[in-house]
Amino acid sequence: CKAMHVAQPAVVLASSRGIASFVCEYASPGKATEVRVTVLRQADSQVTEVCAATYMMGNELTFLDDSICTGTSSGNQVNLTIQGLRAMDTGLYICKVELMYPPPYYLGIGNGTQIYVIDPEPCPDSDF
């Protein structure tokens, strides 16, 4: 029996509005009804939590009200969107998936998605 595999894209470029989206897919060894997804950011050797959501299979992901993350789920795929990103937020974003219920518990950690964020150039003043 192997660790639960979590797949995510290697690289994503955030939009000019600071929005990045990627898919986090997990190979579920069992029929989970309650799943927890956490997005972690690794910069240097530090890993910090970006956001987390627990959801019942078939239902929407619910992040905290002022979370910078939103997401939807479909089967064993979670579509994650991170908003409000700036150049300083460039880094490795790791998807962590936990099958919380029913037992047994499974934990899978992805290899991370490198998100590149480029701050837009300020618009030059125009005469119009």
């Epitope: 660790a3 639960m4 060894p29 910090t48 939590e49 956001c51 919380m100 047994p104 499974y106």
Partner: antibody
Framework: DVKLVESGGGLVKLGGSLKLSCAAS????????MSWVRQTPEKRLELVAA????????YYPDTVKGRFTISRDNAKNTLYLQMSSLKSEDSALYYC??????????WGQGTTLTVSS | ENVLTQSPAIMSASPGERVTMTCSAS?????MHWYQQKSNTSPKLWIY???KLASGVPGRFSGSGSRNSYSLTISSMEAEDVATYYC???????????FGGGTKLEIK
Amino acid sequence: DVKLVESGGGLVKLGGSLKLSCAASGFTFNIYYMSWVRQTPEKRLELVAAINPDGGNTYYPDTVKGRFTISRDNAKNTLYLQMSSLKSEDSALYYCARYGGPGFDSWGQGTTLTVSS
Amino acid sequence: ENVLTQSPAIMSASPGERVTMTCSASSSVSYMHWYQQKSNTSPKLWIYDTSKLASGVPGRFSGSGSRNSYSLTISSMEAEDVATYYCFPGSGFPFMYTFGGGTKLEIK
């Protein structure tokens, strides 16, 4: 019932080595992340090593990196901690702990390491 | 490193008294777990996912909080609650965290 039984602790000289074992039973060992947590004489709890279910990924804090090696034998349902270049500050009670849905949900009774000069 | 600071380090309460201890995280986390450790025994998971009681935990215990600040409350102190309580993040990357320093609860 989940059962974790540590063994291998003892008195070791400064700079010496020791290997701890943890025999697991009562659950499907090969699907869980496992860890070693130590409790210092001052009663602080410190996570010193963790390993994923198939043994392919290991995690250590900087305090023990390069000196401690965690491993597992899923066929024997056993977790190990190889410790070398031991320091006085490594003296502690070492617990084997299972990382389940709600954090470290099962703990062994602990085995004591004393590093003497 | 996400540092967890528990306060107070030591406290004592009379039987029947309400007890609250806190755990502050230097970085935001979505959930917090609490462990109880009685003298000469192993730690036990006591409260998980911030507010859920582990199996066998009396209903006088409760947990609350969010982001950087969490707390454990005992509505009415009893002698069997004498122990040290440790917090540990329930989300984020578990194997890069340290436990809180603990709150030792004594009875008056």
